[in-house]
C-alpha cells in the first residue's frame, strides 16, 4: 500500500487565486457548480460517497468519474490534500486496470499501479498521488465532462 496519508477533514475545494479557470470561453462553458479548465468541466464533490455511488452520481450528470490524461491535469486544484475517487477499477475479464470508458491505464501515469490491490478502487490526490482503497470506503469524488 502506498504511504501517502489521507487527511480526513478539508473544506470543499475552491480554486486558488492564481488559477486561471475558464468561464464561457470558446471551448468551455460549464454548468453551475462545475469548474472549467483546459476545455474540460469538472465537478468536485464536497460529499463523501462509495466508489459505486460516486460513479452513479457522475453518470446522472451525463459525465464520468475522472479519467486522467496526465498527472498535471488537475493543476488548478493542486493545493488540495484530499483524495478523490476517480474512474479507475480493475477488470477481472481483461486482467487490467481500466478507465470507465474501457480504455487501459497507462503505466506511466501511476508507476506504482502494480502494487494496487485489484479488489480495491482508486482514490487520487491532485498532487499526483494515488491510493487503492476498499470500494466501500467513502471519499469525495471528481466527475469530468470533456467538451471537445
Amino acid at each position: 500500500k502506498n504511504s501517502f496519508t489521507k487527511l480526513s477533514i478539508e473544506p470543499a475545494f475552491t480554486p486558488g487565486p492564481n488559477i486561471e479557470l475558464q468561464k464561457d470561453s470558446d471551448c468551455c462553458s460549464c454548468q453551475e457548480k462545475w469548474v472549467g479548465y483546459r476545455c474540460n468541466c469538472y465537478f468536485i464533490s464536497s460529499e463523501q460517497k462509495t466508489w459505486n455511488e460516486s460513479r452513479h452520481l457522475c453518470a446522472s450528470q451525463k459525465s464520468s468519474l475522472l479519467q486522467l490524461q496526465n498527472t498535471d491535469e488537475l493543476d488548478f486544484m493542486s493545493s488540495s490534500q484530499q483524495f478523490y475517487w476517480i474512474g479507475l477499477s480493475y477488470s477481472e475479464e481483461h486482467t487490467a486496470w481500466l478507465w470507465e470508458n474501457g480504455s487501459a491505464l497507462s503505466q506511466y501515469l501511476f508507476p506504482s499501479f502494480e502494487t494496487f490491490n485489484t479488489k480495491n478502487c482508486i482514490a487520487y490526490n491532485p498532487n499526483g498521488n494515488a491510493l487503492d482503497e476498499s470500494c466501500e470506503d467513502k471519499n469525495r469524488y471528481i466527475c469530468k465532462q470533456q467538451l471537445i
Epitope: Q31, E32, K33, R55, H56, L57, C58, A59, S60, Q61, K62, S63, S64, L65, Q67, G87, E100, N101, G102, Q146
Partner: antibody, heavy 121, light 113 residues
Framework: QLVESGGGLVQPGGSLRLACAAS????????MNWVRQAPGKGLEWVSV????????YCADSVKGRFTISRDNSKNTLHLQLNSLRAEDTAVYYC????????????????WGQGTLVTVSS | EIVMTQSPDSLAVSLGERATINCKSS????????????LAWYQQKPGQPPNLLIY???TRESGVPDRFSGSGSGTDFTLTISSLQAEDVAVYYC?????????FGGGTKVEIK
C-alpha cells in the same frame, strides 16, 4: 413522502394549479418531476425542475401551456396548467429524482399517489 | 426524442414460471464515457403509482426481490422475473433517462396463466 393535490374537473381552455407536498428528504437537494398517466394508458413525462428552481425542462406536448415551479421554503412543487385540452386528462404524479439537484438524467425513486385532472365540457 | 418500444403488450405466465419482458430504444442509451445504460424498469399495480425495480439497466433497487433482474445494453433490454409470484401481477414499464425528454415504453401487462 410525496402528496399531490389540486386536481379536479375543468373545462377545455381552463386552468388548474397542482401542488406536491414533500417530506422525509431534503427537498432543495433534488430535482423534481411531473409525470402523467391518461386513464388506461401508459406513463408520460411532463416536466422537471432543478433543486434550486432555476432550470426547467418540459415535454413538447405541454410547452407554452404548463409551468413547473417550486417553493423550497415550503417543500412544495407546483405545476400550473393553462389552456387545458381533453387530451390533458390524466392522473398527475410528482416524482423525485434519485440523485442530486443538478442531475436531470435520472430514474425516479419516489412517487406520489397522484391527483386526477379531468378536462371536459 | 428516444422512442421506447416494449413487447409483448401482455403476458400470461404460470406461477413459478419465468416471465420475460423486452424493451427496445430507437437509439442507444449507452453513454460511451462511462459505459452505463440509462434505462430503468418500474412496476405499477392497479390504483398505485409506479415503483422502481431496476436502474442503470441491471442494478436492483434496494428491497426489490432478487427474482427481478435486468439485462441488456445499447438499444435492447430485458426484464426477467425468474419465478412469477401472485404479487407480481402488474404493468411493467421501461424508461430511458439518457436524454430529455425522458420517455417510457408503452407497458407490458403481466398476468397469471
Amino acid at each position: 413522502q410525496l402528496v399531490e393535490s389540486g386536481g379536479g374537473l375543468v373545462q377545455p381552455g381552463g386552468s388548474l394549479r397542482l401542488a406536491c407536498a414533500a417530506s422525509g428528504f431534503t427537498f432543495s437537494n433534488y430535482a423534481m418531476n411531473w409525470v402523467r398517466q391518461a386513464p388506461g394508458k401508459g406513463l408520460e413525462w411532463v416536466s422537471v425542475i432543478s433543486g434550486s428552481g432555476d432550470t426547467t425542462y418540459c415535454a413538447d406536448s405541454v410547452k407554452g401551456r404548463f409551468t413547473i415551479s417550486r417553493d423550497n421554503s415550503k417543500n412544495t412543487l407546483h405545476l400550473q396548467l393553462n389552456s387545458l385540452r381533453a387530451e390533458d386528462t390524466a392522473v398527475y404524479y410528482c416524482a423525485k429524482n434519485c440523485y442530486g439537484s443538478g442531475s436531470y438524467y435520472n430514474h425516479f425513486d419516489y412517487w406520489g399517489q397522484g391527483t386526477l385532472v379531468t378536462v371536459s365540457s | 426524442e428516444i422512442v421506447m418500444t416494449q413487447s409483448p403488450d401482455s403476458l400470461a405466465v404460470s406461477l413459478g414460471e419465468r416471465a420475460t419482458i423486452n424493451c427496445k430504444s430507437s437509439q442507444s442509451v449507452l453513454y460511451s464515457s462511462n459505459r452505463m445504460n440509462y434505462l430503468a424498469w418500474y412496476q405499477q399495480k392497479p390504483g398505485q403509482p409506479p415503483n422502481l425495480l431496476i436502474y442503470w439497466a441491471s442494478t436492483r433497487e434496494s428491497g426489490v426481490p432478487d427474482r427481478f433482474s435486468g439485462s441488456g445494453s445499447g438499444t435492447d433490454f430485458t426484464l426477467t422475473i425468474s419465478s412469477l409470484q401472485a404479487e407480481d401481477v402488474a404493468v411493467y414499464y421501461c424508461q430511458q433517462y439518457y436524454s430529455i425528454p425522458l420517455t417510457f415504453g408503452g407497458g407490458t401487462k403481466v398476468e397469471i396463466k
